[in-house]
């Protein structure tokens, strides 16, 4: 695997994609040396593709200049101005706006509660075997194990909070030293990451949009594991987070504070524990080595539970185990103690939809894992649908310039800590870091927010996420105060030497740059998105982790030469960039390699034929289902009844002919229109702005 | 009713073994501990060790040990005590002792005992 | 081993009388402790155990009190069925052991 994919027989060119600030992009394939290519991620103007739910009406234009692809879509409006328009229409088009807004706003409150139905459908399915991940006690000695395994855990449950809780709970029963939670806090940062990768994935449909939303949504990835490469090491060598984190919880004496402001769950949970409730203690207790646990189910059924306070006899193995001297007695066999058991009578159920049910929790898991991807999904079509009407014109100038402008000179390198703030601010209101970077990646993708915005945004939720940690250490019981406190501390540190790290210079942003880059080949070949959603967050994780139980021998013996090549790969590729003539003409591209190795072409033949068999078949219902099809197989023919693959194969065939982006549209309407979905007089009847 | 019945009286010569039984009825044999206690004429009581029943699972008083094994035949409700390297001071009324009362070390049902006499 | 130190080792009194026998352990040894009659030629009655918990059949002028390491048995008015040993008895540690005995007559 080449370490930049699609390099061909094209030289190193650093200046192809220029993004201001980020500094210099990921070399690109020069198009005219590929002609041939049915493909049109990075491609001149001749070959904008045509949006795949589309119609196959092929809108002529002249050639214009080639466009930096992660430029912003500008979406004209061609509706009728406010000022033109009668009584009639502006009443109309006022309860249109506000139509539009509520069924935002609705399908932003169901995409936000099938996020949370996201994650606890991971946590059955995957939650026991996240908690026994736990339960292995060579995390004390290796902070890469713990790495892992906190990135593991908190991609099986989908949710930072829950593995960092276990590390708490474990930390506070002495089952674990901070020293060794640290490295899995980590890796809870990188896991909780992957939720905005999987709602990229739905953006699909549309290359440059898809491009946008999984660039945008990777930074986040990239700007965790980065971080990771260079403080895990440093806090294994100086352990700087355990040292500041121990002296600031030792300088203060805290009292016990309030539970951290639930205000988002406010308003989603009445919907979401309708459909499942959880005992999110078993995980823990799983993690804890409790084998009464693991035969548990975690789906919650009983909600109003009387606890009642006995004594009862038990054996004990020695006097020396009894719970006091005078609590100790024999039977002239067995030496008998009495203990205090809490007896848990059951008065009323939880009134949930699989209360009574009493499937097993995989299967409940499973149900749940794909009503809530196709919810996720469908919500964020509409979303986008809904925002894509709404934001032309006027109204997206406006959004855009708020967003995306920085402040007059000399202030302009504010705004992006103001950004940080934000986005801190914002996570901190929803409670969730997934959610803030989920709700950005759509907005992304449609072009409202560009990548080196969402970038400071999502730093921003990261120090959220971890203030809200914070308050939740403070509310934390005495026992727990100061372990929770201090994990929760190491968490926000860790993220401010990140942004340390990869902010303030903007050479350093590396994670834009990357991301770009993953962007491109993603838009390019989309079933390189799932491989690297696969690899990143399971196999590489998994065989670390497989290699960490065989021993630190074995984990050396495979990872130095690993590492060692990456490394090599990555001089070699800086110097092929910057100062080729030092190379040997051989190694001043990659054409040493064999193609397999150096582009991702050959793979996608193989790609291709694997999925060709699930071509005919993979979706001929609805667009929904296209886009999850097209992700898969990246296929032409695909979708049969919604045409939108076919209508892109059309568009690929003419390559000749300049085809109109659906970004170009003067309006939505147009390219329903050229659908049939809509009479072509209604075109006039659009309404423009809220 | 409960009832334990004991073996006759027996007369041994010093380091000579001695096998005394306990037949039990009137209660689930299984469920409860039986006790061996023994009396010297004129002294207090001794306890010698106890058996489990169920599991067949023993524990003996440190003093007897290696010297005294309890041993029990379910199929006849039947519980064993056996003393070997008799010696004079070992010649006294041995008696079963039944512990109805679950958990506890107290013994609710006696045996009538059985005198073992040591003498040469 | 815990040692049970009982005192009197004997007592003569009248019928009707107050009697108190106590027993003393060597160790704290909670409430885990029983009384047992014996009458001369017979086998040991539990009388009490769990300190002051009645046996089953057990007459109400028997009564016991105590923890830790001192412990009573009382009859509170001695019947001439009463005439015989006790032994009281601790059952916190293995081994089960017995005090000397209280020999109670009736003059």
């Known amino acids: 695997m080449a370490p930049w994919p699609e390099l061909g027989d094209a030289q190193p060119n650093p200046d192809k994609y220029l993004e201001g600030a980020a500094g210099q992009q990921p070399t690109a394939p020069d198009k005219s040396k590929e002609t041939n290519k049915t493909d049109n991620t990075e491609a001149p103007v001749t070959k904008i593709e045509l949006l795949p739910s589309y119609s196959t009406a092929t809108l002529i234009d002249e050639p214009t200049e080639v466009d930096d692809p992660w430029n912003l879509p500008t979406l004209q409006d061609s509706g009728i101005k406010w000022s033109e328009r009668d009584t009639k229409g502006k009443i109309l088009c006022f309860f249109q706006g506000i139509g539009r807004l509520i069924l935002l706003l609705g399908f932003l409150y169901f995409f936000v509660c099938s996020l949370d139905i996201l994650s606890s459908a991971f946590q059955l399915v995957g939650g026991k075997m996240a908690g026994q991940f736990f339960s292995n006690s060579s995390i004390m000695s290796n902070p890469l194990l713990g790495l892992v395994i906190g990135v593991l855990v908190t991609v099986l449950v989908q949710s930072s909070s829950t593995s960092t809780s276990i590390v708490v709970s474990m930390v506070s029963s002495s089952l674990l030293t901070v020293r060794a939670a640290i490295p899995i806090i980590m890796g809870a940062n990188i896991g909780t990451s992957i939720t905005n990768t999987i709602v990229a994935l739905m953006q699909v449909g549309d290359r440059s949009e898809f491009r946008r939303a999984f660039a945008g949504a990777t930074v986040h990835d990239f700007f965790n594991w980065l971080s990771v490469l260079v403080l895990l090491p440093v806090e294994v060598a100086t352990h700087y987070l355990e040292i500041i984190t121990q002296l600031i919880v030792e300088s203060f004496h805290f009292k016990n504070g309030e539970d951290a402001p639930d205000l988002l769950k406010v308003i989603t949970k009445p919907f979401t524990k309708l459909i499942v409730q959880l005992d999110k203690k078993v995980i823990s207790q799983i993690a804890m080595n409790d084998e009464k646990a693991k035969n548990k189910s975690l789906v919650k059924i009983w909600c109003k539970t009387f606890t009642n306070k006995t004594q009862i006899n038990v054996t004990v193995p020695s006097t020396a185990n009894c719970t006091s001297p005078s609590l100790c007695w024999t039977d002239g066999i067995q030496n008998w103690t009495m203990k205090n058991v809490t007896y848990k009578e059951n008065i009323a159920k939880c009134q949930h939809i699989f209360v009574n049910f009493h499937l097993p929790d995989l299967a409940v898991g499973t149900i749940l894992l794909i009503l809530s991807l196709l919810v996720l999904c469908g919500c964020l079509i509409m979303i986008v649908k809904i925002l894509g009407s709404v934001l032309k014109g006027q109204v997206a100038t406006v959004i855009k310039k708020t967003i995306n402008t920085d402040f007059p000179f000399p202030f302009a390198w504010l705004t992006g800590y103001l950004a940080i703030l934000v986005g801190a601010g914002m996570t901190f209101i929803v409670q969730s870091s997934s959610v803030f970077t989920s709700a950005l990646t759509p907005l992304i993708g449609i072009g409202v927010i560009t990548i080196e915005r969402a970038y400071p945004l999502t730093l921003g939720s990261n120090i959220g996420t971890t203030t809200t940690a914070i308050l939740a250490a403070l509310a934390s019981p005495g026992n727990a105060l100061r372990s929770s406190l201090q994990i929760a501390l190491c968490h926000f540190f860790f993220n401010i030497s990140g942004i340390l790290l990869w902010y303030p210079i903007p050479f350093t942003r590396l994670p834009i740059r990357m991301a770009k880059g993953l962007g491109n080949i993603s838009a390019k070949y989309r079933w390189f998105a799932v491989f690297y959603l696969i690899i990143f967050f399971f196999l590489i994780p998994l065989t670390v982790f497989g290699l960490s139980l065989a021993g630190w021998r074995v984990l050396v013996g495979v990872g130095v030469p690993v590492v060692f090549i990456i490394i090599l790969v990555l001089c070699l590729r800086l110097l092929q960039s910057r100062c080729p003539r030092v190379l040997p003409k051989k190694l001043q591209n990659w054409n040493f390699l064999p193609l397999w190795m150096r582009s991702l072409k050959p793979w996608d033949a193989v790609v291709s034929k694997f999925t060709g068999c699930f071509q005919m078949r993979c979706c001929c219902c609805c667009r929904v289902c296209c886009r999850a099809c097209c992700l898969l197989c990246d296929c032409p023919k695909c979708c049969r009844c919604s045409k939108c693959c076919e209508d892109l194969e059309e568009a690929q065939e003419g390559q000749d002919v300049p085809v109109k982006a659906p970004e170009t549209f003067d309006n939505i309407t147009i390219s329903r229109e050229a659908q049939g979905e809509v009479p072509a007089s209604d075109s006039k009847t659009e309404c423009t702005a809220l | 009713q409960v009832q334990l019945v004991q073996s006759g009286a027996e007369v041994k010569k010093p380091g000579a073994s001695v096998k005394v039984s306990c037949k039990a009825s009137?209660?689930?044999?299984?469920?409860?501990?039986m006790h061996w206690v023994r009396q010297a004429p004129g002294q207090g009581l001794e306890w010698m060790g106890a058996?489990?029943?169920?599991?067949?699972?023993?524990s003996y008083n440190q003093k007897f040990k290696g010297r005294v094994t309890m041993t029990r035949d379910t199929s006849t409700s039947t519980v064993y005590m056996e003393l070997s390297s008799l010696r004079s001071e070992d010649t006294a009324v041995y008696y079963c002792a039944s512990s109805t009362i679950i958990t506890t070390g107290a013994v609710d049902y006696w045996g009538q005992g059985t005198l073992v006499t040591v003498s040469s | 081993d815990i040692q049970m130190t009982q005192s009197p080792s004997s007592l003569s009194t009248s019928v009707g009388d107050r009697v108190t026998i106590t027993c003393k352990a060597s160790?704290?040894?909670?409430?885990?402790v029983a009384w047992y009659q014996q009458k001369p030629g017979k086998s040991p009655k539990l009388l009490i155990y769990?300190?002051?918990t009645r046996h089953t059949g057990v007459p109400s002028r028997f009564s016991g009190s105590g923890s830790g390491t001192d412990f009573t048995l009382i009859i509170s008015s001695l019947q001439p069925e009463d005439v015989a040993t006790y032994y009281c008895q601790q059952y916190s540690r293995i081994p089960l052991t017995f005090g000397g005995g209280t020999k109670v007559e009736i003059k």
């Open positions: 160790q704290d040894v909670g409430t885990a």
């Open positions: 009137g209660y689930t044999f299984i469920t409860y501990n």
């Open positions: 769990w300190t002051s």
């Open positions: 058996i489990y029943p169920g599991s067949g699972d023993t």
